[in-house]
Interface confidence: medium
C-alpha cells in the first residue's frame, strides 16, 4: 500500500516566500513519520524535513541551506519556504514516510509543484517636487 500525495501544480513566490501544502491520503495523528520536500526532477536536493515522533516536539530542519518551517495537519504537512532566490525556480516534490506503527509506508511519487520565484522589483518612490517658484 502506498500513500497518495496531492500538491498544487504551480505556486508563485512573489515575495520570495511560499507555502506548499502536501496533502496525504493518510492520517498522521499519533504516527511517527518523516515528511520531506525535494527539489528538481530527480529530487536530488532535500529542501526541508518535518519529523514527528512520540517523544519530542515536531522537528523541522533543512540540511541544504533553505529557510523553512513546517506545520502539521491531520492529513497534511505545509512547508513554508522563505528567502527563495529566482534561480531556485524548479519543481518540488512532497515525500512522506511513516515508520510507526508498522508496516512502514511511503508515498507514490506525486506530480510535484512548480515553484516560480519572482524577483523583488523595487519601485522607485514618486517624486514630490518642492514649492513652485515664480
Amino acid at each position: 500500500n502506498k500513500i497518495l500525495v496531492k500538491q498544487s501544480p504551480m505556486l508563485v513566490a512573489y515575495d520570495n516566500a511560499v507555502n506548499l501544502s502536501c496533502k496525504y491520503s493518510y492520517n498522521l495523528f499519533s504516527r511517527e513519520f518523516r515528511a520531506s520536500l525535494h527539489k528538481g526532477l530527480d529530487s536530488a536536493v532535500e529542501v526541508c524535513v518535518v519529523y514527528g515522533n512520540y517523544s519530542q516536539q515536531l522537528q523541522v530542519y533543512s540540511k541544504t541551506g533553505f529557510n523553512c518551517d513546517g506545520k502539521l495537519g491531520n492529513e497534511s504537512v505545509t512547508f513554508y519556504l522563505q528567502n527563495l532566490y529566482v534561480n531556485q525556480t524548479d519543481i518540488y516534490f512532497c515525500k512522506i514516510e511513516v515508520m510507526y506503527p508498522p508496516p512502514y509506508l511511503d508515498n507514490e511519487k506525486s506530480n510535484g509543484t512548480i515553484i516560480h520565484v519572482k524577483g523583488k522589483h523595487l519601485c522607485p518612490s514618486p517624486l514630490f517636487p518642492g514649492p513652485s517658484k515664480p
Epitope: L28, R31, E32, G52, N53, Y54, S55, Q57, G73
Partner: nanobody, 120 residues
Amino acid sequence: EVQLLESGGGLVQPGGSLRLSCAASGFTFDSANMSWARQAPGKGLEWVSWIEAPGVQTFYADSVFGRFTISRDNSKNTLYLQMNSLRAEDTAVYYCARSPFGPLYGFDYRGQGTLVTVSS
C-alpha cells in the same frame, strides 16, 4: 498540583450523543495543549483527539473523524469532547490529558477517566 477531572460519561444507545467535560486546575490551562484518549476493555490506550492551546488547530484519530469534536473554553479552564453517532466500539474509559508538545506525542498528566458505554 495538576488536576484533571472528567465528567459526562454514561450509558447511551448506538447512534446517540454525549458531551464529555474535563475541568483543569493547577496549571495555566490557556497555554496548554490538551488531548482526549480512551481505553477500551482489554485494549491499549488510543489517542482520540488533540487541541492546541489557543483552540485553533485540532487533530482526530481516523476512528472518530467526523463524529467527535474537541473544543475548549479557556475562560472556564475546561476541555470538551462532543461525541455524536456513537457506536458500540466507542465503549471505553475516556481520559483527558495535558499534552505539552504536539498531537503526536504523549502526555505528562491525565485524569482518572470517565466511562462511556454504548449499548442497546
